[in-house]
């Protein structure tokens, strides 16, 4: 650092900026001598408004420094990102966003829960709001799933009228024939592939209604499809294996007591879906009077032994192999309670006794020619077989 050129004049003695220090410290600085500035933790080098990671100035032959002195400014993380369906609170002080400041994110109570972390973020020396787990992106307020106003039990086809908030995941799909679906998260609808197959290349033609109780009521939340994903293993007009589809909505819907997503089954869900366990199907499909229901109806039906169901559909007019391992059956041997045309795509839901949340076990798929027929059963897509498929699509799109 010491280059003695006696002809050259020394540069002005540099003064380190506040919250910074200078190195090396010398008695004087002459031609080609240099110094660097280092800021204390939580302070950043700025040349005016320009960020610098490092700074060094060199003494020139005319006795001036080649660079102006930078400043060490306290790191400011700036206003934190907004949290959809949540809020942010300044803990350190009103609007304080500088080094070591703390903020607390929280989600709207009841209908949203925080995913990823506890919501506490600190403004770190690198200028980013950071959680205790080291995440820089804000948390996510995920809709709480499987909440229902309905108490379990109680005695569609052979069903009864639903009350507000009983089936808040219920989605009415118009645009082709009447069909149904179930809300997942706040921007996906789970349905049957056969119910929306005709619209697979024209997602925008689907008229999607949430929060409705009466099929023809003007009181509903309108949603539109951004994209339709039909299971690649589904073949139209060749049976109902892999009869499952997802609709991505073009906007997130606001969750409330009348619009709430259904849960996907946990790994342990099979224990709540054994033979004779009760599931609930809901929809606006044909009732015993042979007409589409005006009011949302529901029916509680037991799961039927798979072999028994397979056998029931091996007799003509059905062909052998109609019931696959990707299906589950539900209904009464005596008949009278079933889902029917117009219910397709709706969820067959079960109560998870451990979490006390409702989850989708089946999707209304197909059944006997005559709904509620004795010795025949409603056939549902077995959702638990498709969890990897569902999660893959939702995470990629």
């Amino acid at each position: 650092h010491h280059h003695h050129h006696h002809a050259s004049q020394p540069c002005p003695y540099p003064m380190a900026p506040p919250n910074g220090h200078l190195s090396p410290v010398q008695a004087k600085y002459i031609l080609k001598d240099s110094f660097s500035i280092f800021c204390e933790p939580g302070y950043e080098l700025l040349q005016g408004h320009l960020p610098l990671k490092s700074f060094a100035a060199v003494c020139q032959k005319d006795g001036s420094w080649d660079q102006p002195m930078p400043s060490c400014s306290i790191v400011d993380c700036g206003p934190p990102d907004d949290l959809p369906s949540g809020r942010v609170e300044y803990i350190t002080g009103p609007e304080v966003t500088t080094y070591k400041a703390v903020i607390q994110y929280s989600c709207e109570e009841t209908f949203y829960t925080m995913k990823v972390n506890d919501g506490k973020y600190v403004c770190e020396a690198d200028g980013f709001w950071t959680s205790s787990k080291g995440e820089r992106s804000p948390p996510v307020c995920e809709p709480v799933c499987g909440l229902s106003a309905r108490t379990t039990g109680g005695r569609i086809y052979g069903g009864q009228k639903a009350k507000p908030g009983d089936f808040p995941w219920q989605v009415l799909i118009l645009g082709g024939s009447t069909a149904a679906g179930a809300l997942l998260y706040d921007n996906w609808v789970l349905t049957a592939a056969h119910a929306i197959y005709e619209q697979k290349h024209d997602a925008s033609s689907l008229d999607i209604r949430l929060g409705a109780l009466k099929r023809l009521s003007p009181h509903y939340t309108q949603a539109w499809a951004e994209a339709v994903f039909i299971h690649e293993g589904y073949t139209h007009d060749a049976g109902f294996d892999n009869d499952i589809a997802l609709i991505k909505l073009n906007n997130k819907v606001v969750i409330n007591s009348n619009i709430t997503p259904i849960c996907l089954p946990r790994k342990e869900a099979e224990s709540f879906m054994r033979t004779d366990d009760i599931g609930t199907a809901s929809g606006w499909g044909l009732t015993q009077r042979g007409l589409l229901a005006r009011n949302l109806m529901y029916v509680d039906i037991p799961i039927v032994d798979h072999q028994k169901c397979t056998a029931a559909y091996e007799k003509p007019p059905y062909s052998g192999g109609s019931v696959t391992a990707n299906m589950l059956c539900a209904g009464l041997e005596s008949g009278g309670k079933d889902s029917c045309r117009g219910d397709a795509g709706g969820a067959l839901v079960f109560l998870d006794n451990e979490t006390q949340r409702w989850f989708v076990g089946g999707i209304v798929s197909w059944g006997s020619m005559n709904c509620g027929e004795a010795g025949q059963y409603g056939v549902y897509t077995k959702v638990i077989n498709y969890i990897p498929w569902i999660k893959n699509i939702i995470s990629n799109f």
Partner: antibody, heavy 117, light 112 residues
Framework: EVQLQESGPGLVKPSQSLSLACTVT?????????WHWIRQFPGNKLEWMGF???????NYNPPLTSRISITRDTSKNQFFLQLNSVTTEDTATYYC??????????WGQGTLVTVSA | NVLMTQTPLSLPVSLGDQASISCRSS???????????LEWYMQKPGQSPKLLIY???RRFSGVPDRFSGSGSGTDFTLKISRVEAEDLGVYYC?????????FGAGTKLELK
């Protein structure tokens, strides 16, 4: 010697998004400094749009804040400009540049973007 | 926004002449850290602008010493002591002291 090169579509339709990339050679964008986007309108008026710093923090020209996003891909040593809801008023030559103690010491050669139906 | 006003908008010169371009800002360019972030750029047709001068008077590397900058507060000047053919183009002053940073409208240096 650091070199910067802009790339992206030369024609964008109104209401769509304009997306440009700046590929940097001869210097790592994470090593130091700020990396800027500037545009020059027909008639030669120059406007600074914003920068992304070596650490990934951004600073935007306030009138553009609601429409602009500057991001980066450190593995490719590139940084990007996205400008949403463009109008014919966004027709300009777009430059990327690097600062130090000065604002724009090194510039790309610029790319003309026309906004037209 | 800080308005940067350049005069003249056009400057006809003969080779070897001294040229002087003035730039006035609508407010002081002294930053809170004491530095003045006033810069000069030059642009030739079909090329990107090039930095000439920063912090009022410092020459950028490779810039000939016939270019000099001076001024303080709100009034600044770029001088070219002997104009050469390669100096013809448009000159812009720029302030980096206040965000948003802003450019002047430009001064065209051309042959008489």
């Amino acid at each position: 010697e650091v070199q910067l090169q802009e790339s992206g579509p030369g024609l964008v339709k109104p209401s769509q998004s304009l997306s440009l990339a700046c590929t940097v050679t001869g210097y790592s964008i994470t090593s130091d400094y700020a990396w800027h986007w500037i545009r020059q309108f027909p008639g030669n008026k120059l406007e600074w749009m914003g920068f992304i710093s070596y650490s990934g923090r951004t600073n935007y020209n306030p009138p553009l804040t609601s429409r602009i996003s500057i991001t980066r891909d450190t593995s490719k040593n590139q940084f990007f400009l996205q400008l949403n809801s463009v109008t014919t008023e966004d027709t300009a030559t777009y430059y990327c540049a690097r600062s130090y103690d000065y604002w724009f010491g090194y510039w790309g050669q610029g790319t003309l973007v026309t906004v037209s139906a | 926004n800080v308005l940067m006003t350049q005069t003249p908008l056009s400057l006809p010169v003969s080779l070897g002449d001294q040229a002087s371009i003035s730039c006035r800002s609508s407010q002081s360019l002294v930053h809170s850290n004491g530095n003045t972030y006033l810069e000069w750029y030059m642009q030739k047709p079909g090329q990107s602008p090039k930095l000439l001068i920063y912090t009022v008077s410092r020459r950028f590397s490779g810039v000939p010493d016939r270019f000099s900058g001076s001024g303080s507060g709100t009034d600044f000047t770029l001088k070219i002591s002997r104009v050469e053919a390669e100096d013809l183009g448009v000159y812009y002053c720029f302030q980096g002291s206040h965000v948003p940073v802003t450019f002047g409208a430009g001064t065209k240096l051309e042959l008489k």
